[in-house]
Interface confidence: low
C-alpha cells in the first residue's frame, strides 16, 4: 500500500490558530516601547498582517521609529526617538494570520497612549495641632484630563475611616471637624487613582501630630468648605448637581440642608458623606434658586447659601 506523501503526520495541513495575543486594552506611557503580540500556529507556515482602525498597518514602514519584528511571528515592538511618539500609534489594532487553509483573527487590541501622572516632589512638614482643634490635610492631585478617584490610606494600605468627624471633600482634601489623640499618625497618604492609565500615584505621607490637652474647648461650627457665606453656580439641565458643606467645631457639627425657595425635590435628592454632600439628579428648571446648608452643634450654627441658576445644556 502506498500512502500519499501529504498524509504523513508531519505533512498534515493545519489552518491558522491564534496562540498568543496582546490584552484587549493596552495603555502605554510616553517613554514606553509599544509591543503588540500576535503568535499563531498552522501548516503551511502562517503569514501575518495587521490593521489599525481597519486600515492595513505595516510597522516597518513607519517613519521616525525603530521597529523590531520577530521572525516567524506577528509580534512587533516600536521604539520611538522622542517622548511623545506613542500618541501617534493610538488606535484599534487587529492581527490576521493566514495560510492556504484560511485566516485567523486576533481580538481587537485598543492601544491608548497616556501621559504619566506625577505628583510634584515636595517636602511635607509635620502638621501639629491641639486635641479638639480642626485641621485640613491637603491632597492637591496633579491635573488630569480623565476622571480620577482619590483615596486616603495609611502606609498599611488601609483606608482612613471616615465619619461625621473625618471627611474627604470632593476636592480630595481630608477634613477633621476636631482631632482626637487617636488621629495621631505619621502616615496619612493621599492616593490618586487614574483609571484610564491603570495608575495609582501617592503623595508624600503627612505626619499629623496631635497634642493632648486636659480639657477640650467647645467651639461653635465654622465652615471649612466653602469658606465664604454664599456662592453662585450654574447647573445644566438634565445633569447632576453636587453641593457640599464641611464644617468644623466641637462637639462635631451635624449638617442639614434647606431650600428656602420651596420644597426639596425628595425623589431626586440624595445625601451622601454623612449629609455633607447633596446630590440632585437630573436638574430641571424648577430646581433654580437657593440651597442652604446649616452646620449645628450645641454652641451654635454656621451656614452657606448656594444660589443655583439652571441653564439649558
Amino acid at each position: 500500500i502506498q500512502i500519499p506523501e501529504e498524509y504523513e503526520g508531519h505533512h498534515v495541513m493545519e489552518p491558522p490558530v491564534i496562540t498568543e495575543q496582546s490584552p484587549r486594552r493596552l495603555v502605554v506611557f510616553p517613554t514606553d516601547d509599544i509591543s503588540l503580540k500576535c503568535e499563531a500556529s498552522g501548516k503551511p507556515e502562517v503569514q501575518f498582517r495587521w490593521t489599525r482602525d481597519g486600515v492595513h498597518f505595516k510597522p516597518k514602514e513607519e517613519l521616525g521609529v525603530t521597529v523590531y519584528q520577530s521572525p516567524h511571528s506577528g509580534s512587533f515592538t516600536i521604539t520611538g526617538n522622542n517622548s511623545n511618539f506613542a500618541q501617534r500609534f493610538q488606535g484599534i489594532y487587529r492581527c490576521f494570520a493566514s495560510n492556504k487553509l484560511g485566516t485567523a483573527m486576533s481580538h481587537e487590541i485598543r492601544l491608548m497612549a497616556e501621559g504619566a501622572p506625577k505628583w510634584p516632589k515636595e517636602t511635607v512638614k509635620p502638621v501639629e495641632v491641639e486635641e479638639g482643634e480642626s485641621v485640613v490635610l491637603p491632597c492637591n492631585p496633579p491635573p488630569s484630563a480623565e476622571p480620577l478617584r482619590i483615596y486616603w490610606m495609611n502606609s498599611k494600605i488601609l483606608h482612613i475611616k471616615q465619619d461625621e468627624r473625618v471627611t474627604m471633600g470632593q476636592n480630595g482634601n481630608l477634613y477633621f471637624a476636631n482631632v482626637l489623640t487617636s488621629d495621631n499618625h505619621s502616615d496619612y497618604i493621599c492616593h490618586a487613582h487614574f483609571p484610564g492609565t491603570r495608575t495609582i500615584i501617592q503623595k508624600e505621607p503627612i505626619d499629623l501630630r496631635v497634642k493632648a490637652t486636659n480639657s477640650m474647648i467647645d467651639r461653635k461650627p465654622r465652615l471649612l468648605f466653602p469658606t465664604n457665606s454664599s456662592s453662585h453656580l450654574v447647573a445644566l439641565q438634565g445633569q447632576p448637581l453636587v453641593l457640599e458643606c464641611i464644617a468644623e467645631g466641637f462637639p462635631t457639627p451635624t449638617i442639614k440642608w434647606l431650600r428656602p425657595s420651596g420644597p426639596m425635590p425628595a425623589d431626586r435628592v440624595t445625601y451622601q458623606n454623612h449629609n455633607k454632600t447633596l446630590q440632585l439628579l437630573k436638574v430641571g428648571e424648577e430646581d433654580d434658586g437657593e440651597y442652604r446648608c446649616l452646620a449645628e452643634n450645641s454652641l451654635g450654627s454656621a451656614r452657606h447659601a448656594y444660589y443655583v441658576t439652571v441653564e439649558a445644556a
Partner: antibody
Framework: QVQLVQSGSELKKPGASVKLSCKAS????????MQWVRQAPGQGLEWIGE????????NYNEMFKSRAVLSVDTSVSTAYMQLCSLKAEDTAVYYC???????????WGQGTLVTVSS | DIVMTQSPDSLAVSLGERVTMNCKSS????????????LAWYQQKPGQPPKLLIY???TRESGVPDRFSGSGSGTDFTLTISSLQAEDVALYYC?????????FGQGTKLEIK
Amino acid sequence: QVQLVQSGSELKKPGASVKLSCKASGYTFTSYWMQWVRQAPGQGLEWIGEINPSNGRTNYNEMFKSRAVLSVDTSVSTAYMQLCSLKAEDTAVYYCALYDGYYAMDYWGQGTLVTVSS
Amino acid sequence: DIVMTQSPDSLAVSLGERVTMNCKSSQSLLYSSNQKNYLAWYQQKPGQPPKLLIYWASTRESGVPDRFSGSGSGTDFTLTISSLQAEDVALYYCQQYHSYPFTFGQGTKLEIK
C-alpha cells in the same frame, strides 16, 4: 460612594423576553465599562458582555450574542440588559458590575433574580 | 475561550490555619510588555454579589485584609489566606480578563473544619 442598584425579580415564561436595569450613582457613569454577569442557582459565574456607556460600544460572549442586547441611557445613568427567547436554563441571578481601570469588577449590583418557568 | 480550572472544589480548614487554593488557565494570562497577569480573585458569600479581593494576580484591592494574598504567573495562580477567620467562609472564584470572553473558574468552597 459608588452604587449600582438593579431592578426587582422577574418571573417569565419560556420564549418571553426580559429587560433588566442597573442604575449607577456616585461616579461618572460614562467613565467605566459596565459588565453583565449571571449565576444560575448553585452554579458559577458566567460573563454575558460589556458596554461602554460613553459610546455604546459592546462586547458579547458569543454564547449570548444572538439573544442579549446591552444598552444605556446616560441621562439617567442606567444600563440595561435585554435577554430574549428565554429558556428554563436562563433562570439565574443577573448582576451588573463596574469595570474599573484595573480591569477587574470592583463594584457589583445586588443582583436580579430571573425565573423562567411555564 | 480561555478555560479556568480551580482546585480543590471544596476544602475545610480550622480557624487560624493557612488556606491555599489554586487556579489554572488554559493559556498564559501574562502579558510580557507590562509584566501583568490579567487575573482576579473574588469572594462570594451566600445571597451576596461577588467581592473583588485581588487583581493583576497579586495586587490586593483596597480595604481587603492583608491576610489575603495572590501569587503566580502565566497559567498557574494561588490565593492564600494566611490565618483563616470565621468571616472568610465563602465561595472563591478566579477570573481572567486577558481575552474575550472573560471567564471564571468553577469556584472553590471554603468551610471551617
